[in-house]
């Protein structure tokens, strides 16, 4: 199926041009999305082109400036947050990135009723996290690893925790591993629905081994960055959850929430917290061996001022074929009775589906079913449940939004998006206002992305929020590559692939092939989304065919494919890339002497192993920031899929699956190894060990490091990286510069 047909016709050829590397590096063909910042059922905020913060009322159709660009500029604000009572706005400036989600910033509070900044009891700086209560204008913030509370912005703060200490005790914010691998947020505190209580996590990293690396900067001596980072098998953070009454915070102080006995008996993780009501909270816990998860519903006991988590309100989710959940264990979406909930987990056929849990997980009512997967529950209202899935036309790389009417019996299902803009839009997400009165749909492709506003009752489109007209016009004279998404059936395994073909593709000719791989557990590369990126350029200008293949271990096609890699990372992911390459060669248009593979992060690991597979298929390849041994990567991620690196568990496969173990096999390929020296995630250690093994085996290879760059290799490093990789591939494929 050709998703993005080239617009080239003979008469137009003279005016059309190919993509250039400069186009990609300059972001010339980047697209915009529009996510409303909902503040009620019918109102949202949005930052206008001229940087005013504007309120839009859907019902009246009118806009209102609530914060002028001058006010924003007066403190160099790059972000804002409106208090729910609409009395104040916080303005965020001096953004300073830390890890993937975390950053520190300076915060100013602006009073909307008098148009002035709040003076007196100003916030300290820099703050690690700050948020309004869900009702009113209480403030909770984290400063120097401790949590503070303000009843009103101008009030003096009440200090909730006192034991916070850099790299030791984290209150209300996650440590490195919880941020990256468990919570996927910069915060670890949660207000109850009406702001009566504040729950927070405390992470104790005292006994965690520290990763240390040099940050060269421009001083005479480099700095050393120290991060408590538990690698596979190492000591993990100790987590505790506390809840404090924010109305009378000094009365009884923070109360600890008990951990379920079956969890507390060995090493465990806290995975998420969901408030149900002001006096009911749901916590999710996970054993260190991540195939058992417990969802615990706890109630506030007024008489004792404590939180009680009865065993009858513990729901166990266990996997016998892999790990619990997909990438993460799914979170519950509670219904209006405040005890039953909807949750995505594997059905008896091994497909992730929505279930309704009223009393026990064993008695769960399955809401969706089929050989496809429910991916996200967006919203549950009194009469509807909105979710996304890849059911439509059996393409796993699509996302459509569905509505199930739960108010009627039997419940009826309607695809909201399937036929809206069928050619242009096959991959959606959604953003809902209060009570799903309205919602925005954001379509990511395969055509040019478009964001639209819809009535939550009738699903009628109200207006286009962003249609990327400028992008559409800019692309009119560009020879875009063709894209097709198809599947290969090999030994009872379905391998979906995306192929990106040069604009004047001719099946009778031979083309160099580049495989782009990620391949990590529960990932998906073959998606029906729009992108004009480096590989688009390689196809458009350099005449390469690029292929992405979703093999075993990838997501949204059932547990058989997903859990196939359980406890044996680095085997089937590589095999499936190789199998796909052989199938591509059989198609007749691939020059089998010019095949390359490249990947980043997990993809760097897979590309390295593929190059060292000894098949002779690959002429060259690139690994950017690769994992080289699972013993070097984070405990939470690695052990989820690999178990522990101990003799009585899975040490043997930890050792067998390293890149270093295959150093000899790199002798007959051209290998380019790239890594940032300040990579906090996949440590430079990984590439250092590959390089050492290659040197020890006297194998020639090319390498590039990026000083003081992290896992993202951003800024000027990006330009250098893609320029360098382009030269390497052109040389490998004997393409003239």
């Amino acid at each position: 199926i050709v998703l993005r047909p080239s617009r080239v016709h003979n008469s137009e050829e003279n005016t059309m041009r190919a993509l250039t590397l400069k186009d990609i590096l300059n972001g010339t063909f980047s697209y915009k999305t529009f996510f409303p910042n909902w503040i009620s059922g019918q109102e949202y905020l949005h930052q206008s082109a001229d940087n005013n913060i504007v309120l839009y009322n859907i019902e009246t159709g009118q806009s209102y400036t609530i914060l002028s660009n001058r006010t924003m500029k007066s403190v160099n604000a790059s972000n804002y947050g409106l208090s729910p009572d609409r009395q104040f706005v916080y303005l965020e400036s001096d953004y300073s990135k830390l890890w993937r989600y975390s950053y520190t910033a300076t915060y100013y509070i602006y009073d909307l009723s008098n148009g002035e900044f709040v003076r007196g009891n100003e916030l300290p700086r820099p703050i690690q996290y700050l948020c309004w209560s869900p009702v009113g204008s209480k403030l909770a913030y984290v400063y120097q690893n401790n949590i503070y509370l303000k009843q009103r912005p101008g009030d003096p703060p009440f200090q909730i925790t006192f034991n916070g200490r850099e790299n030791k005790i984290f209150n209300g914010i996650p440590d490195w591993v919880y941020e990256e691998e468990m919570l996927a947020t910069k915060y670890a505190l949660w207000w109850s629905p009406n702001g009566k209580f504040l729950a927070y996590a405390e992470f104790n990293d005292t006994d965690i081994p520290v990763i240390a690396y040099s940050y060269y900067g421009d001083e005479q001596y480099p700095r050393t960055i120290n991060i408590p980072y538990p690698k596979a098998g190492a000591k993990n953070p100790v987590v505790r959850i506390f809840i404090i009454d924010t109305t009378y915070p000094a009365y009884v102080g923070p109360q600890e929430v008990p951990v379920p006995a079956m969890i507390a008996s060995s090493d465990y993780y806290f995975s998420w917290l969901t408030w149900v009501t002001d006096e009911r909270v749901c916590l999710q816990w996970l054993k260190r061996v991540q195939n058992v998860s417990v969802l615990s519903i706890c109630d506030f006991r007024e008489d004792w001022q404590t939180w009680d988590c009865p065993k009858t309100q513990e729901h166990i989710e266990e996997s016998r074929t892999g790990w619990a959940g997909g990438f993460f264990v799914s979170t519950p979406v509670f219904s209006y009775d405040a005890i039953s909930y909807y949750k995505i987990f594997s059905d008896k056929d091994g497909y992730k589906h929505i279930h309704y849990i009223k009393d026990t997980v064993e008695n769960a009512i399955q809401i969706t079913s089929g050989k496809w997967e429910a991916i996200n529950i967006f919203r549950v209202t009194q009469d509807s449940l909105f979710y996304s899935s890849n059911e439509f036309e059996e393409y796993p790389g699509r996302r459509n939004i569905y509505r199930i009417s739960i108010g009627s019996y039997p419940p009826s299902k309607k695809c909201v998006t399937c036929h809206l803009r069928k050619e242009r839009c096959q991959y959606y997400t959604a953003s809902f206002s209060d009570y799903a009165k309205y919602y925005a749909l954001v379509c990511y492709g395969p055509g040019i992305p478009i964001s639209t506003l819809h009535d939550g009752r009738t699903d009628q489109e109200i207006k286009i929020l962003e249609e990327n007209k400028e992008l559409e016009n800019a692309l009119k004279n560009i020879q875009l590559p063709k894209e097709e998404i198809k599947k290969l059936e090999v030994d009872e395994i379905t391998l979906w692939y995306k192929m990106i073909l040069p604009p004047q593709f001719d099946r009778s000719k031979k083309y160099p092939l580049l495989i782009q791989v990620y391949g990590g557990p529960c990932s998906q590369s073959v998606r029906s989304v729009f992108a004009v990126n480096w590989i688009s350029y390689l196809a458009s200008k350099e005449g390469m065919v690029i292929a992405l293949v979703d093999g075993r271990g990838t997501a949204f096609q059932g547990d058989k494919l997903l859990y196939a890699v359980y406890r044996k990372l680095g085997v089937y992911e590589v095999e499936d890339q190789i199998t796909a390459v052989r199938k591509f060669i059989e198609m007749g248009f691939i020059d089998e002497k010019r095949i390359a593979i490249w990947g980043w992060s997990y993809g760097g690991y897979v590309s390295s192993l593929a190059l060292a597979s000894g098949t002779g298929l690959f002429k060259c390849g690139i690994a950017v920031a690769p994992v080289s041994s699972w013993e070097y990567y984070a405990s939470v991620y690695t052990e989820r899929f690999m178990g522990l690196p101990t003799k009585d568990d899975n040490l043997e496969h930890y050792k067998n699956s390293t890149v270093m173990a295959r150093a000899e096999y790199f002798r007959n390929v051209d290998y380019l190894l790239i890594h940032g020296t300040a990579d906090d995630n996949v440590h430079f250690q990984n590439s250092a060990q590959i390089a050492k093994a290659l040197v020890n085996a006297q194998v020639d290879f090319q390498a590039m490091w990026y000083s003081d760059q992290n896992h993202g290799l951003s800024g000027l490093s990006t330009n250098h990286l893609y320029t360098h990789m382009t030269h390497f591939l052109k040389q490998c494929f004997s393409l003239s510069d």
Partner: antibody, heavy 119, light 111 residues
Framework: EVQLLESGGGLVQPGGSLRLSCAAS????????MDWVRQAPGKGLEWVGD????????IYNQKFKGRFTISRDNSKNTLYLQMNSLRAEDTAVYYC????????????WGQGTTVTVSS | DIQMTQSPSSLSASVGDRVTITCRAS??????????INWFQQKPGKAPKLLIY???NRGSGVPSRFSGSGSGTDFTLTISSLQPEDFATYFC?????????FGGGTKVEIK
């Protein structure tokens, strides 16, 4: 100090037209929406409509739609109300107000200008 | 349109009295936890002045003796201790739905 000063009121015959002006000072016009409200002699207050000065987007009380038009000139920091096909019942004091959108509140009012529709 | 009914239409009170004016909307004006009910004070020959916005928030420079409360359809303006300068007409107004509508007014007179 925020000040709103209406002008342009007067006596007009039924069926006639009138254009009211409102000069805003003490703040930037584009920072707030502007509304017109009228008050008939001895009667209550009646909302006419609202304008978003940045784009000129307007909303009206359905009762006045088609006859009354709100516009603005940002360079002059001035708001206008064009009234056509005037009737005797349009006789009132017309106030221009600054509308604080986040609170849906008219926080500053002009002193008003009187419009009399009579033959 | 939402009708706003004020009561009483007039009242007589003395300086120092506690005065309560009520306003009833023909339908709920709750907007997801907020009610866009505003109160204005108008003196003869003058423009109205914003006293209370969003049900209970005092406007700029408004004395603390003025307070507002209510939700749904029923709202109240309270003057805790009437002062000589408070003798005026008071209007409630809803901004929850277009057209924005005003109550008929309550005239507070000297007893």
């Amino acid at each position: 100090e925020v000040q709103l000063l209406e002008s342009g009121g007067g006596l007009v015959q039924p069926g006639g037209s009138l254009r009211l002006s409102c000069a805003a000072s003490g703040y930037t016009l584009t920072d707030y929406n502007m509304d017109w409200v009228r008050q008939a002699p001895g009667k209550g207050l009646e909302w006419v409509g609202d304008i978003y000065p940045n784009t000129g987007g307007t909303i009206y009380n359905q009762k006045f739609k088609g006859r009354f038009t709100i516009s603005r000139d940002n360079s002059k920091n001035t708001l206008y109300l064009q009234m056509n096909s005037l009737r005797a019942e349009d006789t009132a004091v017309y106030y221009c107000t600054r509308f604080r959108g986040i609170h849906y509140a008219m926080d500053y009012w002009g002193q008003g200008t009187t419009v009399t529709v009579s033959s | 349109d939402i009708q706003m009914t004020q009561s009483p239409s007039s009242l007589s009170a003395s300086v120092g009295d506690r005065v309560t004016i009520t306003c009833r909307a023909s339908e709920s004006v709750d907007n997801y936890g907020l009610s866009f009910i505003n109160w204005f004070q108008q003196k003869p020959g003058k423009a109205p002045k914003l006293l209370i916005y969003g049900t209970s928030n005092r406007g700029s420079g408004v004395p603390s003796r003025f307070s507002g409360s209510g939700s749904g359809t029923d709202f109240t303006l309270t003057i805790s201790s009437l002062q000589p300068e408070d003798f005026a007409t008071y209007f409630c107004q809803q901004s929850n739905e277009v057209p924005y509508t005003f109550g008929g007014g309550t005239k507070v007179e000297i007893k």
